[in-house]
């Protein structure tokens, strides 16, 4: 579908004259019609098969046609198609005089004609007009020509339809050719397809508008590239959705059990070593001066004897400070002015000079230290028992006596404890997390099943004819005490009366 | 194809007792840890038992220590959830679960779950 249009520019008639040569009186009140039909090698009447139009009277003799509206007709002419153009035409422009107002064919004289030319060629569909002049022996008419396709019509023939739409259909506008151009943030055949969020997951991701990121179930982030955990895990991650892959140091289905006590928690105090012995379980190993499961408690810096030779030592704000006994010095009393003839050594302890009698050396029997050996060993300074096991000196030897639950020369073992057997009377052991639980048999309560408790055998009224009722504690048995009258375990003969049998 | 299938749950008075199974397939049986969990409606799923792939280490929660045993049988692909002294509180989905590896860490696999009513 399209428009030839013709634009009339100017007409010479200047003597006034029709095609006869007979004058027009009182000058020629000139129109024109117009006829475009299909290529003809010679151009003859008939029908306008590509459409007429008619001007209205436009001047009078010669005159220029302006380029907008002219007593109501339309400058440039118009002669619309509804097919595709062939590329090639035929025209044939008539200009007729009007005596009168009625310019239809059927009211004018046959003789009111003034002029008649006939072209024909190709003509492509253009914006650009083509200029023409016809010259006859009496008049010219100067015109330009073009075609071009009606809106929404494109391409050489104008026989592509292309509307430009922003709705659910399409978001586009139309090239000159009639192809589509999408809108920004469109793509697809039809333009109907929006363009995600740069980045955005191609699986994981989809979007309904341009620059959106919307997730799929099972991914989040802003490109819909980080799956969502397992509902309910704690301390892990995931490479695909609802997996829950503990992170380093945590266990259990949900990763919220405590692996690693010791990074998480930091319980050791003061420098000590962290030890991971289990689920929420630690070992601190304290550094010297410290003690205490966490290693909380500083020990008394005088407790690791630091001073030498007899030296006393007493505590400060800043540390400790050694009182030498006579003939030493120095920050730990180490240095004597003593020699092998002061006699120095304590204890039996037997003396060698040095450096030529300028200094000496002890040495001390066992169970003496010290460099006069005026200390006796204590083997308990370098805190050896384990699990809070307290140290003990026993002579030449030491031993540590544990925490329960621990066992070893250190109490370096953990150990169940239910392994000594501390339920009494059968009792059955139940290991619990911090101790244990006995389930006494009958008979038996306490915490170790130790009380025995008394089964009342004259509960069930065993004694006859009033007689008093005794539980024999020992034995959980009972024990009759007969009415005057009666005799026999449960009180049931009457004296006198010998028990009747059946045989 | 990995699947974990439970069966068991149903309605109990409270006090009785239920045995829960998961049958799986699609791997290796006895070279994954399996476990079970629960979620009542609203509430955050709750990690309840596990059995690592040999049987030597199973861990339970403490709202079913004592209660709840678990154990697995691997000639039967089958691992078993014994439920005993059942409470209201007990109510709930129970699923079964695999973290995919040997040891009870995390969750890879899950199965459609069976529901359990513990109501007089």
């Known amino acids: 579908s399209g428009v030839f249009q013709l634009q009339l520019q100017e007409f010479i008639n200047e003597r006034g004259v029709l095609a006869s040569g007979r004058p027009c009186e009182p000058g020629c009140r000139t129109f024109f019609r117009v006829c475009l039909k299909h290529f003809q090698a010679v151009v003859s009447p008939g029908p306008c098969t590509f459409g007429t139009v008619s001007t209205p009277v436009l001047g009078t003799n010669s005159f220029a046609v302006r380029d907008d509206s002219s007593g109501g007709g339309r400058n440039p002419l118009q002669l619309p198609f509804n097919f595709t153009w062939p590329g090639t035409f035929s025209l044939i422009i008539e200009a007729w005089h009007a005596p009168g107002d009625d310019l239809r064919p059927e009211a004018l004289p046959p003789d009111a004609l003034i002029s008649k030319i006939a072209i024909q060629g190709s003509l492509a569909v253009g914006q650009n007009w083509l200029l023409d002049e016809q010259t006859s022996t009496l008049t010219r008419l100067r015109y330009s020509y073009r075609v071009i396709c009606s809106d929404n019509y494109y391409g050489d023939n104008c026989s592509r339809l292309c509307k430009k739409r922003n709705d659910h259909f399409g978001h586009y506008v139309c090239q000159p050719d009639g192809n589509l151009s999408c809108l920004p943030g469109w793509t697809g055949e039809y333009c109907q397809q929006p363009i995600c969020l740069s980045g955005c997951h191609e699986q994981n991701g989809y979007c309904s508008k341009p620059a959106e990121c919307l997730c799929r179930p099972g991914w989040q982030g802003r490109l819909c590239n980080e799956c969502i955990p397992h509902n309910g895990c704690r301390h892990g991650t995931c490479s695909t959705p609802w997996q829950c892959t503990c992170d380093e140091g945590w266990g259990g289905l949900f990763c919220d059990q405590d692996l690693n006590y010791c990074t998480h928690h930091s319980p050791c105090k003061n420098g000590a070593t962290c030890s991971n012995s289990g689920q929420r379980s630690y070992t601190c190993t304290c550094r010297p001066g410290y003690t205490g499961v966490d290693c909380e408690l500083e020990l008394s810096e005088c407790d690791s004897n630091p001073c030498r030779n007899g030296g006393s030592c007493k505590d400060q704000e800043d540390g400790y400070h050694c009182l030498c006994p006579p003939g030493y010095y120095g920050l730990h009393c180490e240095h004597s002015t003593l020699s092998c003839a002061d006699s120095p050594c304590f204890n039996g302890g037997s003396c060698r000079e040095r450096n030529q009698g300028a200094n000496y050396a002890c040495e001390c029997p066992p169970n003496f230290t010290g460099s006069n050996c005026e200390k006796k060993v204590d083997r308990c300074t370098s805190n050896p028992c384990a699990n809070g096991g307290q140290c003990l000196n026993r002579g030449p030897s030491r031993m540590c006596r544990c925490r329960p639950g621990f066992t070893g020369t250190y109490c370096e073992l953990h150990v169940s404890d239910c392994a000594r057997n501390p339920c009494a009377h059968g009792g059955t052991c139940h290991d619990l997390e911090n101790g244990l639980m006995c389930t006494c048999p009958a008979g038996f309560s306490g915490r170790r099943c130790e009380v025995r408790t008394s089964i009342d055998a004259c509960a069930s009224s065993p004694c006859f004819n009033r007689a008093t009722c005794y539980t024999d504690l020992s034995t959980d048995t009972f024990v009759c005490n007969c009415p005057y009258g009666f005799v026999g375990s449960r009180c049931e003969f009457p004296v006198g009366l010998p028990p009747s049998f059946p045989w | 194809k990995v699947q974990l299938v439970e069966s068991g749950g149903g309605l109990v008075q409270p006090g009785g007792s239920l045995r829960l199974s998961c049958a799986a397939s699609?791997?290796?049986?006895?070279?994954?840890?399996i476990g079970w969990f629960r979620q009542a409606p609203g509430k955050e799923p709750e990690g309840i038992s596990c059995?690592?792939?040999?049987?030597?280490?199973?861990y339970y929660a403490d709202s079913v220590k004592g209660r709840f045993t678990i154990s697995r049988d691997n000639a039967k692909n089958t691992v078993y959830l014994q439920m005993n002294s059942l409470k209201p509180e007990d109510t709930a989905v129970y699923y079964c679960?695999?973290?995919?590896?040997?040891?009870?860490?995390?969750?890879?696999?899950t199965g459609q779950g069976t529901q359990v009513t513990v109501s007089s």
């Open positions: 699609g791997f290796t049986f006895d070279d994954y840890a």
């Open positions: 059995i690592s792939s040999s049987g030597g280490i199973t």
């Open positions: 679960a695999t973290p995919g590896i040997a040891a009870c860490r995390g969750i890879h696999y």
